[in-house]
Each structure stands twice: as structure tokens, then as C-alpha cells.
């Protein structure tokens, strides 16, 4: 009685169950009643990451430096190459097929989270008591200077873009 279903890591062909090829190998010939499935290793720069019956291995991803990409993890016969972006850039998608320059936070905004190879800069508005006077991908909002601790008084109020200006206290004569 020929099988109608096969075990895990097997497939049904010509009324018999053949073993799938292990990750890193491709199918050359199905099994017969005399011999097992014939599988061969993927070549240089190729991979297959599952138990399979593929007759061709997949090409490793190319991390194109013209797109700002570099290799984060070299591919093997069982895994694809993982790309990331050059310093100062981040991936435009989860697949990391291209890169864009990290966003800078404008004056009045500070960096809440510094960008990584896969995520952009996250900016936040500087709350009352804090300011940022530069456009930066790294600078957080800075607290206004405390005039009191310097025995000075506020001569000009701070904003989200400027620090307070301190000056000497007026002395009564």
C-alpha cells in the first residue's frame, strides 16, 4: 500500500516517501527504491535555510556600499547575509535593502533615542525648563542654566531653543 502522507522532513513523490535535503543542501535527485534522496551542498555565496526539496540554492544578499550598506553578518550555506548601514545611516525597511541618513533633531527638539543601523533618530520637543539650540542627531535637550545656584538672576527667560541669560543681582543702595 503506497503512503499518502509522510513523516516530518520527508516528502511524497512517485508513491514513496523521500527525505528532504537538510539546510545548506539542494536536491539533485529524488530517492528510489534503491537509494536515498541525493542532495548536494550549496555553492559559495549560496544558501538554503530550511529542510527542502529545492533544486537551486538562493543567492546571498549583496550589501551594496553604493546604497550605504555593509555586511553585519556574513552568510553561510544555511543562512543569508545580514546587511546593516554605514555609520550615520539606517535601514529604510526591515529587509534593509537601502539606507538613509539619520535624521537630526531641529533646534527646540532633542534626541529621545539615538538612531541605530535599523532605526531612525527619535526626537522629542524640549519641555519647559529645557532647550536645544542645535540641529543634531545626538544632542538631548539641555536643562536651562540655574542662575540661582550661581548667585545670579535671570535676565532673559529661556525658551525651547535658547538658554536663560543670567546676570548679577541688582543691589539696593
Amino acid at each position: 500500500e503506497p503512503p499518502t502522507a509522510c513523516r516530518e522532513k520527508q516528502y511524497l513523490i512517485n508513491s514513496q516517501c523521500c527525505s528532504l535535503c537538510q539546510p545548506g543542501q539542494k536536491l539533485v535527485s529524488d530517492c528510489t527504491e534503491f537509494t536515498e534522496t541525493e542532495c548536494l551542498p550549496c555553492g559559495e555565496s549560496e544558501f538554503l535555510d530550511t529542510w527542502n526539496r529545492e533544486t537551486h540554492c538562493h543567492q546571498h544578499k549583496y550589501c551594496d556600499p553604493n546604497l550605504g550598506l555593509r555586511v553585519q553578518q556574513k552568510g553561510t550555506s544555511e543562512t543569508d547575509t545580514i546587511c546593516t548601514c554605514e555609520e550615520g545611516w539606517h535601514c529604510t525597511s526591515e529587509a534593509c535593502e537601502s539606507c538613509v541618513l539619520h535624521r537630526s533633531c531641529s533646534p527646540g527638539f532633542g534626541v529621545k533615542q539615538i538612531a541605530t543601523g535599523v532605526s531612525d533618530t527619535i526626537c522629542e520637543p524640549c519641555p519647559v525648563g529645557f532647550f536645544s539650540n542645535v540641529s543634531s542627531a545626538f544632542e538631548k535637550c539641555h536643562p536651562w542654566t540655574s542662575c540661582e545656584t550661581k548667585d545670579l538672576v535671570v535676565q532673559q527667560a529661556g525658551t525651547n531653543k535658547t538658554d536663560v541669560v543670567c546676570g548679577p543681582q541688582d543691589r539696593l543702595r
Epitope: 529524488d30 528510489t32 551542498p41 533544486t55
Partner: antibody, heavy 115, light 111 residues
Framework: QVQLVQSGAEVKKPGSSVKVSCKAS????????ISWVRQAPGQGLEWMGM????????SYAQKFQGRVTMTRDTSTSTVYMELSSLRPEDTAVYYC????????WGQGTLVTVSS | QSALTQPPSASGSPGQSVTISCTGT?????????VSWYQQHPGNAPKLIIY???KRPSGIPDRFSASKSGNTASLTVSGLQADDEADYYC??????????FGGGTKLTVLG
Amino acid sequence: QVQLVQSGAEVKKPGSSVKVSCKASGGTFSSYAISWVRQAPGQGLEWMGMINPSGGTTSYAQKFQGRVTMTRDTSTSTVYMELSSLRPEDTAVYYCARGFRMDQWGQGTLVTVSS
Amino acid sequence: QSALTQPPSASGSPGQSVTISCTGTSSDVGAYNFVSWYQQHPGNAPKLIIYDVRKRPSGIPDRFSASKSGNTASLTVSGLQADDEADYYCSSYAGNNRLVFGGGTKLTVLG
């Protein structure tokens, strides 16, 4: 059980071409590669190349690059091996065989190159 | 010039054992566990007797065994019989969808 049946003997003139066929029966034609091997009189086996019938992709031994062409016809479950610019030293029995492992062989085709 | 090196001849008396070697390189025999052995009687097509270094197709007697160490594969025929007299060839996968053969060994059964 896969069976490979090859075309009959050929006599060719130097400089001409020969096309040998290998018809497969039993099994699924697209599910195994076909290798071609030749054996000159009194000599050993020589791997010439292979074709993957599922996609028609080929791989040839460096010695035969540019002179050998392997093709397939999925409608008739037949693969072909054409060797061009024949020389007397191409006189040999040409075999087709299943896969790289070559667990099933055709009966062989004698190609004689003589003026 | 074959890619794999085999002794041209080997011999043994009935009942004895004979071992045939097949030496390649670190790019073929040494790199992959895809060594096969074939038996060829005069006038016939070769027949697969060992694949993937040491596996026997069903129907091949266990008198035929094989192994591999480094860049050298070996075939042993034990309990020699008259019908074992034939040519024996090894082959190995050599990467990039290429295959290489040995030059062949003529096995003679004495007596």
C-alpha cells in the same frame, strides 16, 4: 524504477557534430538531474557535465566548455547531449546517468569519429 | 590525467579481501562526503555499488564496504568471488556542480 534509454550508434566525420538522446521513463522527469559520462575505448570514465531538467540549468566540465550543449524536452522526458567540432579522439561510448550519484545508467551510445 | 588517483590494478584469491584506494584533494574527496564507487564489467555500463562515501544501494551485498580518511577514499571487497573481477571507478563531487572520476582499477580474481 527509472529507466534511461539512449539513441543508437553514430559514425561522424571530424569537424561535424553529434546529438545523443536519453529518454527517461519511470519516476518524475523533472525531479532528477542527468549527468553525461563518456568512455573512450580501453579508457576510464570521464564526466562531461549535467543538466537539471526542472529548470534546464547546466554545468559542464571545463574540458568540454564551448563544445558541449545539453538540453531537455520535458514533453517527451528526453535529454540531449550535443558535441560539436568532433575529433577522432572523441570516439567513445557516451552514457547518460541519473544525478551526480549516477545510480541508474543508460545502455550507452557508441560515437565513432573517422574520416 | 584523472583528477582522482587509483591504482591501475589490484588482485586477490577467492575468499580474500582487497582494498582499492582513491586519492583526491582537499577540494574534492576531502571537502565533501559525496564519494561514489562503480563496478563495470566488460561491455556493460557502470553500476553504482557505493554512494555518499559508505552507503550501499539496496541489492548490493555487504561484502562491498567503503570509507574515507582525509583526501583518500577506500573500497574494500571481502570474500572475493569470481564475478567481482571487473573495473572499479571512484568519483567525487568537486563543488560548483562539478564531478571528477578516478582513472579506474582493474580487479583480478586469481586462480
